[in-house]
Interface confidence: low
Amino acid sequence: AVDLTLLANLRLTDPQRFFLTCVSGEAGAGRGSDAWGPPLLLEKDDRIVRTPPGPPLRLARNGSHQVTLRGFSKPSDLVGVFSCVGGAGARRTRVIYVHNSPGAHLLPDKVTHTVNKGDTAVLSARVHKEKQTDVIWKSNGSYFYTLDWHEAQDGRFLLQLPNVQPPSSGIYSATYLEASPLGSAFFRLIVRGCGAGRWGPGCTKECPGCLHGGVCHDHDGECVCPPGFTGTRCEQACREGRFGQSCQEQCPGISGCRGLTFCLPDPYGCSCGSGWRGSQCQEACAPGHFGADCRLQCQCQNGGTCDRFSGCVCPSGWHGVHCEKSDRIPQILNMASELEFNLETMPRINCAAAGNPFPVRGSIELRKPDGTVLLSTKAIVEPEKTTAEFEVPRLVLADSGFWECRVSTSGGQDSRRFKVNVKVPPVPLAAPRLLTKQSRQLVVSPLVSFSGDGPISTVRLHYRPQDSTMDWSTIVVDPSENVTLMNLRPKTGYSVRVQLSRPGEGGEGAWGPPTLMTTDCPEPLLQPWLEGWHVEGTDRLRVSWSLPLVPGPLVGDGFLLRLWDGTRGQERRENVSSPQARTALLTGLTPGTHYQLDVQLYHCTLLGPASPPAHVLLPPSGPPAPRHLHAQALSDSEIQLTWKHPEALPGPISKYVVEVQVAGGAGDPLWIDVDRPEETSTIIRGLNASTRYLFRMRASIQGLGDWSNTVEESTLGNGLQAEGPVQESRAAEEGLDQ
């Protein structure tokens, strides 16, 4: 099965903190078609559960194998079906998560139900807020069944589905008649394509016997393991707080997997992480229980103790799920559940066994998927175990599949199946991409699409001057980083090729196609200095500069002047395209502003050293501040402002600007124009009741003038929350969640 997990954060006190994350453990997942494979898709599926339109959700990609959905503004945004799609080609897989509103009238006792073909499925909706009306059950959005409200059993409405078949799969819902659909209980029914313990096209093959709540995939017979378990049969527990097919992922946050729902490819569905349970996965397992949703009971024997994440921890001398097996029966030890080798390699596989009587070399054998039995070439005998070593013939793709190590002694026998994945070394399909160039270096992106298998462990970049017969230079780089080729010759063409490797012996792939990259012209080295400047108006500045005298031609195409307005955090750049220029006029500057000024020489796209900076203050413009600003509350949503015109005006006022801000608020202030300059009062409407506001104002002639003093006033009474301050009233609309 594809290693794809959809995590839902269920700490639902605030919908804005809710997020969904899709994590792929697949090699090179999610980087898009121009890199390692098709991207991960994470979206809300509104086909069955439709919710009111709201602001679009925000999708953020975190690295190559993770995508997160945020931006939920109200509880109703969360309700419904979400899906993540990952994996490439025939392995493309959709993982589904169904979210129920915690405040719904009806709540599912269990959201995901995985059943076998021919089973009876029972969906149970618990009454959360009782209504004395019929309950309507729907399947994939279509009417299915009605129950009278008197038919509730122990506060639950049950839907029994006998003899289910794969087409019965889908989203089921239970809703009170006349109630909002958002108050429904939503369920997901997954019907495996085979009866219990079977898989394959005709359901003729036997499942491996998935442990710890793992579910046998009806197409490929692999166990889809619950979060927190790994191995061919889910026999191995991950360390606390880890998940993914190889336990390679870690739950975010300090409280580990608490409050997270995990959804995995069908036929598993969704559950809490190992050690957690409850509708929001925030409750620890009860004593004696462990695993995902705490569904498993330890029942440890022979002095074993129960760990809520991993199950029975056995004392010395015992093993097995319940510590029921004596160490005297032969036992395969520490066999990896999955091994990976590269095509055409001849690996050595070790299989260790212990027991009494002690296993010898001939008692351990290795069986390939095609039934071929390999005998060990040598055995290492230690006091506590025998390790048999098998030399495997050159691997072909057909060797992928389940291998088995078997030990037989007079004390009994044991076998351990493990999966062997034969991988094809990666070969680049395209040439590397030039990102930036300088006179003596090239910055190259080696990430290209490739044939074969990931993950990419190393990237080798081979390069040499064009048309050269000299040896290639090689640089080994991290697959996720751009490469800088250094100490090159200026204005020279280089042939560059990529070679990719995957982990393991024989993982190096063939070289990719070459590309030509040319270094830039030399960088300018001269540092100018500012000779002087003078102000030619409130928004104009004349600047002059000099260069040191050096022999030879000037290396440069022109000058770049930079003005930095620190108050506003803005930079202005002026290009002077002649290398002979030594003066420039800068216009359109902001009056009354303190600028930091410098100049530097440029050549091609390269900048030389900047001159020492100069500090310039432009004279201010604009009218003086309005006088005697006063605020008076009129009602629970209106405040009147009064003021006196500024004195000594340089011209007629075009308008006033009022700034409104909630006292102590962190948001941006709101500016409101008063377009009748003869006025000396205005009423600000649409304010929130019982709220303290700050006001100040300024006049505008051609430019904005100085701010007045700030005044503070509170609205009266207790009323509805308004939409925001305006000068004319606007009716407040009641939101969905109000």
């Epitope: 006190t13 925030q282 620890a284």
Partner: antibody, heavy 126, light 107 residues
Framework: EVQLLESGGGLVQPGGSLRLSCAAS????????MGWVRQAPGKGLEWVSR????????KYADSVKGRFTISRDNSKNTLYLQMNSLRAEDTAVYYC???FGPGDLWSGYYDAFDIWGQGTMVTVSS | QSALTQDPAVSVALGQTVRFTCQGD??????PSWYQQKPGQAPVLVIY???NRPSGIPDRFSGSSSGNTASLTITGAQAEDEADYYC??????????FGTGTKVTVL
């Protein structure tokens, strides 16, 4: 070792106030519901109050509603019970207990106090 | 708040079986938990959920429930089982409620 240790009990006059504390150790306090249960001399157990892991949701018995306040400090692994306007009928041993309900579909819906403190005596008398 | 009603007292011969009940509306939705309390000691949880025992509780204790009635059974009572037993559940408003208690005497 999983442990709950109450403190703060004692003799107080009617109308007075008292604050009980319960220090938790040996388990992840912040993920469990916690509660207070009392037992008057020679009487049965009486549930007093409980609080959810975040501390944002609290429940009270009718007999103490409006007078008692349950709270918790997850950073200190401590549960509190602030008792105001105390009456003679509040005289009891007060136990702090860990609540690991409300169960699930497999083991049934329930609420259970699986860990109890040794109790602290509160006497309200003039 | 709703109450849970228990048998006030029961007695059982050593090694025999005793069953006592707990009745109340909240038991329709919630399984009770059962506690054993010996004089001068804090209560100890013996059964929770459908019929779950915490580790360290002997398997002679078992629980069952149907409708609004639940029961605790001690199969093969021992002298150390002599104690007060309380049932506890949760009502519709999320409050806990304890039963009135049953005094068990082992003869």
């Amino acid at each position: 070792e999983v442990q709950l240790l109450e403190s703060g009990g004692g003799l107080v006059q009617p109308g007075g106030s008292l604050r009980l504390s319960c220090a938790a150790s040996g388990f992840t306090f912040s993920i469990y519901q916690m509660g207070w249960v009392r037992q008057a001399p020679g009487k049965g157990l009486e549930w007093v109050s409980r609080i959810y892991p975040s501390g944002g949701v609290t429940k009270y018995a009718d007999s103490v509603k409006g007078r008692f306040t349950i709270s918790r400090d997850n950073s200190k692994n401590t549960l509190y019970l602030q008792m105001n306007s105390l009456r003679a009928e509040d005289t009891a041993v007060y136990y702090c207990a860990r609540d690991f309900g409300p169960g699930d579909l497999w083991s049934g819906y329930y609420d259970a106090f699986d860990i109890w403190g040794q109790g602290t005596m509160v006497t309200v008398s003039s | 708040q709703s109450a849970l009603t228990q048998d006030p007292a029961v007695s059982v011969a050593l090694g025999q079986t005793v069953r006592f009940t707990c009745q109340g509306d909240s038991l329709r939705n919630y399984h009770p938990s059962w506690y054993q309390q010996k004089p001068g000691q804090a209560p100890v949880l013996v059964i929770y959920g459908k019929n779950n025992r915490p580790s360290g509780i002997p398997d002679r204790f078992s629980g069952s429930s149907s409708g609004n009635t639940a029961s605790l059974t001690i199969t093969g009572a021992q002298a150390e089982d002599e104690a007060d037993y309380y049932c506890n559940s949760r009502d519709s408003s999320g409050n806990h409620v304890f039963g009135t208690g049953t005094k068990v005497t082992v003869l």
